[in-house]
Structure formats: C-alpha cells, structure tokens
Interface confidence: low
Amino acid sequence: AVDLTLLANLRLTDPQRFFLTCVSGEAGAGRGSDAWGPPLLLEKDDRIVRTPPGPPLRLARNGSHQVTLRGFSKPSDLVGVFSCVGGAGARRTRVIYVHNSPGAHLLPDKVTHTVNKGDTAVLSARVHKEKQTDVIWKSNGSYFYTLDWHEAQDGRFLLQLPNVQPPSSGIYSATYLEASPLGSAFFRLIVRGCGAGRWGPGCTKECPGCLHGGVCHDHDGECVCPPGFTGTRCEQACREGRFGQSCQEQCPGISGCRGLTFCLPDPYGCSCGSGWRGSQCQEACAPGHFGADCRLQCQCQNGGTCDRFSGCVCPSGWHGVHCEKSDRIPQILNMASELEFNLETMPRINCAAAGNPFPVRGSIELRKPDGTVLLSTKAIVEPEKTTAEFEVPRLVLADSGFWECRVSTSGGQDSRRFKVNVKVPPVPLAAPRLLTKQSRQLVVSPLVSFSGDGPISTVRLHYRPQDSTMDWSTIVVDPSENVTLMNLRPKTGYSVRVQLSRPGEGGEGAWGPPTLMTTDCPEPLLQPWLEGWHVEGTDRLRVSWSLPLVPGPLVGDGFLLRLWDGTRGQERRENVSSPQARTALLTGLTPGTHYQLDVQLYHCTLLGPASPPAHVLLPPSGPPAPRHLHAQALSDSEIQLTWKHPEALPGPISKYVVEVQVAGGAGDPLWIDVDRPEETSTIIRGLNASTRYLFRMRASIQGLGDWSNTVEESTLGNGLQAEGPVQESRAAEEGLDQ
C-alpha cells in the first residue's frame, strides 16, 4: 500500500487552529512535474457534503512530502469530506477523512466502518441534541432510508446494511428531517472486495494475518498497519508519537499524537493514533488496552506489563505479543556518539540493549554529566533487543557534556558514553526591516541578528494591527527570502515581530522586539483628462484638466503633471499639491520643443491612471535683448527711454515690451507694449514726481526675447523742466499710482 497519511488536528475549540496535514512516506512524493511524479493534493470534497462558502483555505507545502490545509474560520468550515491524493501511476491513492461537527444533532458512534464483502454493516447515530422528527439516512448524498423518531434504540438510530458489496462503499449520513445538514452524523463505509481473510482477483489468496488491528488490502494482500505500528504483519510497535510505514514520521506538538485523527489508504480508513481513543482522540487507553482507538487488549503473560502504545512489555527472558515466548553479557546497541537538543526541552533519548537474560525497562539507566540517574519511562521490546526510552527533565546549559547509557542484568553489564550538546534557541536582537509598502501589503526583510545558537531553520513573522487585541497572524518564511504580508488594511500601522527557530524540538526562540510598519494609502482610481492648454510664452504653458464626477470623497492628495521631451529623452514632473486644483502654470520649459503631456492623480506615494496624453509645441525662443538702454527724466511725470535694436535678429520684431518698477517697491512690475517696432525711443508718462524707477525691455518676434540691462532714473521734482528736445512714441500710457 502507498505510505500516505492524512492527519486531522481535532482541537475543535478553535477552528482557526484546526489543520489537515497529508504526509507521504513515498520516495520523492509530491515533487511536482519532474521525474518523481505528480504532487500531493489535499482538498475539501464538496460533492456530497456541501458547506456555506467561506474564505478560501490555505494550502502550504512543507518540503516534498507534506502538505497542510489551514484557514478554517468557523466550525462549519470543518464539516464534510476531505481527501488527500498521493503516489504515482497505478499507485495513485486517495485517502479520505470525514469530519463531524461536535455540536451536531446526531453523532456517529464510529465514523469509519471497514467490513468484508457479504458482511452486515451497522451504522449507529447517537442522539446528541434531540429533535422529535424523522431521521433521513442518505448514501453518497442520495436518499436511502427513513426512520421514525420513535425507532431510536437506547438513544441511537441504527442503519443495518446486510450482505454489503463493494458498491455500497461511500459516505452515509443521518439527519433529522428539516434540520441543517451540518448537524448530520456522517459515516464512511469501506467494503473490502473479498470475504474475511482473503484477497486477490478471485479472492483466492489468503491474507498474512495482520496484527495489532492492521487490515488486509484486498488488491495486494499487504497489511495496512494502524498508525504506530510497522512490519509486514504490523507486528512491531513504533516509538510513542511516531507513525508511517517505517515509523519515520513524528506527531506534531508537545502532546504527541493526542487529538489527532489518522486516515490511511483503504481499506483501513481512519482512527486515533496508538494509545488514544474517543471522538476527539484525546482520551488515553484504559488499563489493559492499547493500539489505535485502544481497540486491542494486551493479555500479557509471564509478568508482562501493558503499554497503551505498544502492547505487552515483556520481562527478562520473555518476548512475543503476549510475552508468551521464552527467550548473553548484555550489550548496548547502535548508540549515537553525539546528540543535540535545545535548551528547556524535555527530549526522549532511546537506548537499545540485548542480552540473556533479556534486558527489561528497569535494567537500563541513563546517567547525566552531574551524576543524576534517569530511569526509563517506557520500553519497546522486540525479539532481538529492548529499546528504553528516557524522558529527560527540562534541559539546562549545564546538561551539556558526556552522558552514559548503562544496562545491567544478572548476566553482566555494558555502558556507552555519548556527548550531548544543549543549544540556546535564537532570539532576534532587532526588529524586521520594511523594504517596500503598498496599500494592502508590506514587503519585509525578516532575517536579523540574533542571540543564541544557529542555524536558523525557520523564521516566523508575527503581525497584527497596531494597538489591536486580536490574535497575531503568523507566517512561516524561508530564512533567506524577503516576505510579503498580504491582505492588509490600507493606511494602517502593523506591529511586526520575528521569531526564529533552530532545528529540533523546542528550537523556537522568544519573539523579537516589535516594529511599527504602516501600509500605504489606497490607490487613486480616477483618471483625469486634459481639458486644454495655453502657451503663455516660449517657456510657459498653462494646463487645465478635469476629473470624472463620482459619489463620495475624492481619494487623492494632488496631481502630477508629466512633460516628456522625446527629442532629448527628458521627463519633467510638476507636483500640484491640492486635490481641488484643476489648472497649473508650467514655467521654465524649453522653447521650440515638442512635449507630450499627461496628468494623474496621486494619493500618498501611489499614482492613479494617467490621462490620455496631449501633444504641445512651444514656440521657439525670442530675439536677443535690445542694446544700450538709457533712461532720462523729462519732467516730474515723464521719463524717456532710448535703445538700439538687437543684433542678429531671426526675423522682424513685432513689438517691444517695457518693464517698469518703482525702485525698492514691493508691488508687481508693470509691462507696457511698444507697438511700433521701428522706434528706438519711447516716453513713459504718468509717473510720480521725485520717484526712482527701474526699467528694462525686451523684443518679441514669435516669442518674447531676452531682457535688456536694467536702468534707473528718477522723475524730476514738481515744476522743473528737463532741458533738450522731447521725442515721443506712441507707447501705451499707464499710471503706476492708480
């Protein structure tokens, strides 16, 4: 049979902690599309038991042979059928787990029923919350049978299925009429293709006699061993907390396999791990019972004691399932020379010994560096050796050093020294670093300096909204990679902490210091469009735009105008910091340049969609500056300006522009057009008496040219006349004192 196990964690008080893990012991299982074959699949099967839609479940792959399903948010998410598919080609196998709600009206006395062809199957639904209505039995989602509510026997509704055949296999349910399907009792019936003890195409071959509750596979005759047992006939017990065809897997968590349901390939079905029983696999076996679901009885002989995980533990000189078989200087076997554990853990150390008389649990002891002697808490007795398991008290740093395993029997004694290294779990010394942020995600560099011992095996990032009392969200990341925290709230501060782990049980260090990381604003979604633009000079452009009208407040802090000069390959960006603005003056542009122009809304650091672009051609630059500008006061209100035309003109001058400003004044300058470009002088009238003025001027062809030098002159005092002739031009007159 394929080595495939589906584990369900039955911590039902908190669905968010519930998880399903599919573990494959097959070589190269789950590596995907390479030569090793197809990956492991783990999914909820909604074909028969449908539950209300909820948030999608999270699937996490841990290496090549393990996949875990999490993300259950409410108890109803758990109810139903889950399946794991693994193995390649003809060995592709589906393992099924059926989950019942602990609060259902009806509960199955036993969820998985494996029966032989021709047997009578009896499904028993126990009344948990009574309703005085009929009970509907369904098979694979279809109506099968109805029982009147009076037909309950001893608080149970029974469905008898005589002479079952393989097509009868499937999911059965018992539901009160008009009750929620989630309150049903769900069962799984597995009908072997052969009668008891037989296998093969015509059921002609005899099964090997599977021990410890193993089930003979009707296709290949192999024993599908219960969790915690191994061997061709399931004759050998694994160490406590181990499972898989070679006992190679270990139950997660500090409670071993407590609270875990194990599902194996058909025809085994599901059960608790060895040593546990009950609907939630949280009850230890009663004395004298052992194995999966505690279904086996020890019946130990010759002074053997019953271990709920492995069965009979035989005294010296005896072995066999019931210590019924009678059996040199003792010898320590296969002791590792060096072991490593984490500080404050309580590891189990195994020491195996053989000899005649056969070593028993009490004859093997473990000695710590300080001389303390530990006695084993459990022993697994096999025909050729006894393996004593020692539960070491919580390790401290002083426990580092040489330990010794010693076996003593009446035949003599043997000992073996080995080195134990106690390592300190790593603790971050700094907070994680924020790399980039968006409105709904943060990219974080999690690896920081730490105290304690490496190597770092896993990095956990814990995060939650600042000042929140909600549970921390946790993400396990590769130590060498940056991590993206997804599905966050915009514009929200998050407290983020790192927890580092080193290899081995108890390798998780304390949480590092928190840091505050804030998500960005929501992205602005409105697309502006350009209403128009107006050239206000060879280097000046006024732009106006609009936004679509939408209900609600505007999401935006301002606008970004972008001008692209394709000839020079240069981009100019202008920030308009008011979201109410709809116009902007762009200055300092390059005359005679063809620009591509667009505008977009921004919010915090995020840009919205850009408007459709506009193409704008600025006029070329104007003429050089007029030469030799000179000013002379004519009266208390008039000053005459004279100049020479600019040299090297690119074309005919259309006008001159004079700038007039009171010296030291705070007001804006006044511009006056001189519309007769052939003139080289003009009189500025309407000035104030005894006032000092500044003048400069420039010429215009297609665009305004460079400014001339600035000249100063004062108007005369009242009643004084300047000497010499007066030459007037038709310059526009305007008083500066209005």
């Epitope: 404050e344 401290v396 002083a398 549970d471």
Partner: antibody, heavy 117, light 110 residues
Framework: EVQLLESGGGLVQPGGSLRLSCAAS????????MMWVRQAPGKGLEWVSR????????QYADSVKGRFTISRDNSKNTLYLQMNSLRAEDTAVYYC??????????WGQGTMVTVSS | QSELTQPPSASGTPGQRVTISCSGS????????VNWYQQLPGTAPKVVIH???QRPSGVPDRFSGSKSGTSASLAISGLQSEDEADYYC???????????FGGGTKLTVL
Amino acid sequence: EVQLLESGGGLVQPGGSLRLSCAASGFTFSSYVMMWVRQAPGKGLEWVSRIYPSGGITQYADSVKGRFTISRDNSKNTLYLQMNSLRAEDTAVYYCARDVYRAFDIWGQGTMVTVSS
Amino acid sequence: QSELTQPPSASGTPGQRVTISCSGSSSSIGLNPVNWYQQLPGTAPKVVIHSNDQRPSGVPDRFSGSKSGTSASLAISGLQSEDEADYYCAAWDDSLNGPAFGGGTKLTVL
C-alpha cells in the same frame, strides 16, 4: 536547605528606581530558569519576568516591558530585578521563584515595594 | 485581568471534598500542563500540584489535580482546617509567551 531570599524592597516615589536581589542557596543556581512574580495588596499573582540559566534570554510581562530589567550573577547565585520609572500600580510584594518545567517549585518569602508620593 | 478563570471563593466543612475549577484557552491549558499553588495567609505560594496531576513530595494525597481540554480542577478530599488558603492555578500561555495565573480562589473551611 533549598531557599531563596529577596531583598531591596522599600518605599519609592513615582518615577523612581529600585533594585531587588534574590540570593539562592542549596541548589545549582546556574542550571535553573528563574522568575520574578508579584502580588499587589489583596490581589492575585502576576508574572513579571523570567531569565534562562545563562542569562542570555529574558522575557517580560507587557506591563513592565521597557521599564524593568531582569539579570543574574551565577557566580554569586543571585537574581536581580532593576525597576525604573516606577508607577503606583507597581506596588506589590515581589517574589523570586525557581522555574522547573514551568512550575515554580521554590519561592522566596517576598519583599514589599511601595510606590507612593 | 487574569488569563485563567477561577471562582473567587469556595468553602466546605472538615472532612468534605471540595473542587476548584480553572478555565483557560487553547493556547494555555489546551497546550500546556497546569500547576496549582497554595498560599497560606501571610506566606509565599507553594506548589501543591504540578504537570496537571503530579503531587510534589510532602503534599498530602488528599490533594489531586486533573485536566480536560482547556479546563483543569484541583480537588481536596477530607478537608482540614489547615487547608484554608488562597489557591491559584497557573499554566504557560503560548500566546503570551509567559505564564498565566488564575485570579485565585479563597477556600474557607467552615
């Protein structure tokens, strides 16, 4: 005889500082996780801080984080609690305790800290 | 506010059996062993039960502890006057990354 003896308590004004000591004897001090636990007058027990045998790892309750510092001197078999920025709500009997598999098997007799103006 | 919940008081007559409950969460009692402390008036606490049901040497066998799921209880049979004290439950809390104490139960021997 295995025992723990606290000292250093007293009356201090809000915002002030105190340093508590806990002298250990009768066991290998350097091998154990040590704790400080406090009990406000008429109230229940509250964990304050915890330190690993080497002193390299420390843990604090949220209520004292950033204000209190736990430390140890294994050569002197002594545990310390440096308390800064004291508040009225820090008024309590402070016990040191030995932590064995997260059970506190040995306790000192306690030292009273009163924060009042 | 305590992370573990205990009744504030309990009482019984000499010779009676009394039980004190302690309720926690999946991250505290659900995952970790429970310890019980006795605090006689004016003295430091003393552990009477550790690791759910283990009695330290010197503690009478009248004291017993048990745990189921996210709850635990301390039972005292054959109640005696010297048992009058405050009793606190405690368990490591994985979400706090520290120990959590119950608020305490004052046991009165009538």
